[in-house]
């Protein structure tokens, strides 16, 4: 039975040219996290494997930095970075937990962080 929940940074916004941290946190389960995948729509951005550490997709190697923790830092943001991001936690024995974050990249300097929320 999957008892865990994923808490994410929720809906967030940031300025063009700036950077943003995407964060997810898995709680309420004792399952072992074997790997976390970060995806943008269907594109794999990065992997954090419990044994092998961080691996960043070549498509994002100049703009993505691992961490903090299991999170991901996106740099040099462009308007094209607007969209859905998913943190996919592969765990044992529970299986897979997925969190969703919506990022809006703004032209102006009125970017504000959204509230945190939970996905069961």
């Amino acid at each position: 039975m999957m008892t865990g929940t994923i808490e994410t940074t929720g809906n967030i916004s940031a300025e063009k040219g700036g950077s943003i941290i995407l964060q997810c946190h898995l709680s309420s389960t004792t399952a072992q996290v074997t790997q976390v995948n970060w995806e943008q729509q269907d594109q794999l951005l990065a992997i954090c494997n419990a044994d092998l550490g961080w691996h960043i997709s070549p498509s994002f190697k100049d703009r993505v930095a691992p961490g903090p923790g299991l999170g991901l830092t996106l740099q040099s943001l462009t308007v094209n970075d607007t969209g859905e991001y998913f943190c996919i936690y592969h765990t044992y024995p529970d299986g897979t937990y997925t969190g969703r974050i919506f990022l809006e990249v703004l032209e102006s300097s009125v970017a504000e962080h959204g509230a945190r929320f939970q996905i069961p």
Partner: antibody, heavy 118, light 107 residues
Amino acid sequence: EVQLVQSGAEVKKPGESLKISCKGSGYSFTSYWIGWVRQMPGKGLEWMGIIYPGDSDTRYSPSFQGQVTISADKSISTAYLQWSSLKASDTAMYYCARAAWWQGFDHWGQGTLVTVSS
Amino acid sequence: SYELTQPPSVSVAPGQTARITCSGDALGDKYASWYQQKPGQAPVLVIYEDSKRPSGIPERFSGSNSGNTATLTISGTQAEDEADYYCSAKDASFNSVFGGGTKLTVL
């Protein structure tokens, strides 16, 4: 110690089938990709395809798609490369190698020499 | 299909710097790796993810990758560095391709 041990040399006739193997040891077999690389006599390296034994996700080079099949049995930490109908042009040394995601192939098998001749 | 182009041969005097290039369309958007192969032996990884060096590989080996060109640099080349060198590119979907290879001769 990380090791990839490949099956022995094979001599086959055109039209015959073949399955060669690559057994991994000394590491978590399901955490790394296993790739297959062809080297024809006196020629360069050619990437054939790759498999992730953890979930059997497989990618092929367009040049080898439909010509060979890559598979893995994670219960015995072994990857396979097989042909249903060999051609003389399949004569080559075949290497298996492991890679962590986007990293390069950091450990290689010793190679399996396949000779196809009538 | 994607192709990588290397010079067939490069010569260098002992102690000098050897540079082997690898070119491909938007190669800088992929990860470049470099392999050394000596006669009768399996290849050995000398550079991965553009510029990282595996443990056990001497510091004289370095790599870079931007635009359409990846470069393997061997500083203070030694006789034992004489070998064939292959570049490889890996894209976001884990697909790879090798260059045609460069024979490095240490004069």
